[in-house]
């Protein structure tokens, strides 16, 4: 992975259990740059250093993720650790992982996006809704939308609520949901692609 991600992981793995807990709490209230969402509290508090690093990088990308981590460490009084993190990230450009490319799934665009074509089946059959919400939060879901979906009592009603927001999404936003579905319930996506 990139240098910045490794540096974030090093810093978080060097925190005591108590410091890591404090770090997460501070992360819930630290000021964020415009356009960035907050990692959901429920998901955040249960994460270990590795999961938290991945979450920071997926939510804030490597450069800003490292900067944000350093700011929180500094706020905790861990100036030396914050300095080491920033020094480590400035040594290199935070080169991106090679990333083995999956075969393109959507070379030709049909009239309707996959998630619109299979709306009814997805409402009925998606079980891992919380995972989807975490993948979409801060990207295509606002805090209010995230909370509104979570508040629904059943998986189908959660998915129905999620689908109430999709008319305002463009094609690439819908691709993010499809990508999250592939990662969380690939068998379901494969089944629907065959149907």
């Amino acid at each position: 992975m990139g240098r910045a991600r490794d540096a974030i992981l090093d810093a978080l793995e060097n925190l005591t259990a108590e410091e890591l807990k404090k770090f997460k709490l501070k992360l819930l209230s630290v000021p964020l740059r415009e356009g960035y969402g907050r990692i959901p509290r429920g998901a955040l508090l249960s994460m270990d250093a590795l999961d938290l690093t991945d979450k920071l990088v997926s939510f804030y990308l490597e450069t800003y993720g490292a900067e944000l981590t350093a700011n929180v460490l500094r706020d905790m009084g861990l100036q030396e650790m914050a300095g080491q993190l920033q020094a480590a990230t400035h040594q290199g450009s935070g080169a991106a992982p090679a990333g083995i490319q999956a075969p393109p799934q959507s070379a030709a665009k049909p009239g309707l996006h996959f998630i619109d074509q299979h709306r009814a089946a997805l409402i009925a059959r998606v079980t891992n809704v919380e995972w989807l919400l975490d993948a979409l939060y801060g990207k295509v879901l606002t805090d209010e939308q995230y909370q509104a979906v979570r508040a629904e009592p059943t998986n189908p009603s959660k998915m129905r609520k999620l689908f109430s927001f999709t008319p305002a999404w463009n094609w690439t936003c819908k691709d993010l949901l499809l990508q999250a579905l592939r990662e969380s319930q690939s068998y379901l996506v494969e089944d629907l692609e065959r149907s």
């Epitope: 490597e62 080169a95 991106a96 990333g99 665009k109 990207k139 463009n170 690439t172 990508q179």
Partner: antibody
Framework: DVKLVESGEGLVKPGGSLKLSCAVS????????MSWVRQTPEKRLEWVAY????????YYRDTVKGRFTISRDNARNTLYLQMSSLKSEDTAMYYC????????????WGQGTLVTVSA | DIKMTQSPSSMYASLGERVTITCKAS??????LSWFQQIPGKSPKTLIY???RLVDGVPSRFSGSGSGQDYSLTISSLEYEDMGIYYC?????????FGGGTKLEIK
């Protein structure tokens, strides 16, 4: 500072092939979707192809489908456009574009590379 | 495909004048519209995204508005360096489509 630098320009005969590259620096390339857009001699802009950050979503305009292939190498921070069976109407300035999440708006443009298809 | 009809195709305006360029989509594009400026000999530059969001570093005299099918770009007080060609783009669905462009010249 974000930089996108296209290369591969050339004069090609109809039916010929050409590969364009776009070297990217100044940000974590693998996090962003990219597109190729071309500008015809009449100054009309046409979107050509799109590739998502991980390469798993790819889209083309109908007129290039089956002839052009967009790809990326996230380890080399480079975007590619392989063009084959070129036609005179493919003559244009080709730009690579970095698109920002989540809705993939066009944030940064390269300086462009000229492709001329002529007998 | 979504067709983007941009008007006018060319116009002359005086320095300090308020200028408005419009773009009409053939269907609702839910504000997934960008505006670009191209100065002669240069690459296009993004001014506005999501119909009304100004890109960092773009002067505040530029603004975007609209919804549904109808969108506009306004320059509140024209300056000399604003001369060039302006394009709109819908990125609601693939294929992305551009307007035909508006050539803006100084009177």
């Amino acid at each position: 500072d974000v930089k996108l630098v296209e290369s591969g320009e050339g004069l090609v005969k109809p039916g010929g092939s050409l590969k364009l590259s776009c070297a990217v620096s100044g940000f974590t390339f693998s996090n962003y979707a990219m597109s190729w857009v071309r500008q015809t001699p009449e100054k009309r802009l046409e979107w050509v192809a799109y590739i998502s950050s991980g390469g798993d979503f790819i889209y083309y305009r109908d007129t290039v489908k089956g002839r052009f292939t967009i790809s990326r190498d996230n380890a080399r921070n480079t975007l590619y456009l392989q063009m084959s069976s070129l036609k005179s109407e493919d003559t244009a300035m080709y730009y690579c574009i970095l698109q920002l999440r989540p809705e993939a708006w066009f944030a940064y443009w390269g300086q462009g590379t000229l492709v001329t298809v002529s007998a | 495909d979504i067709k983007m009809t941009q008007s006018p195709s060319s116009m002359y305006a005086s320095l300090g004048e308020r200028v408005t360029i419009t773009c009409k989509a053939s269907q609702d594009i839910k504000n997934y519209l960008s505006w670009f400026q191209q100065i002669p000999g240069k690459s296009p530059k993004t001014l506005i995204y999501r119909a009304n969001r100004l890109v960092d570093g773009v002067p505040s005299r530029f603004s975007g508005s609209g919804s549904g099918q109808d969108y506009s770009l306004t320059i509140s007080s024209l300056e000399y360096e604003d001369m060039g060609i302006y394009y709109c783009l819908q990125y609601y669905e693939f294929p992305y489509t551009f307007g035909g462009g508006t050539k803006l010249e100084i009177k």
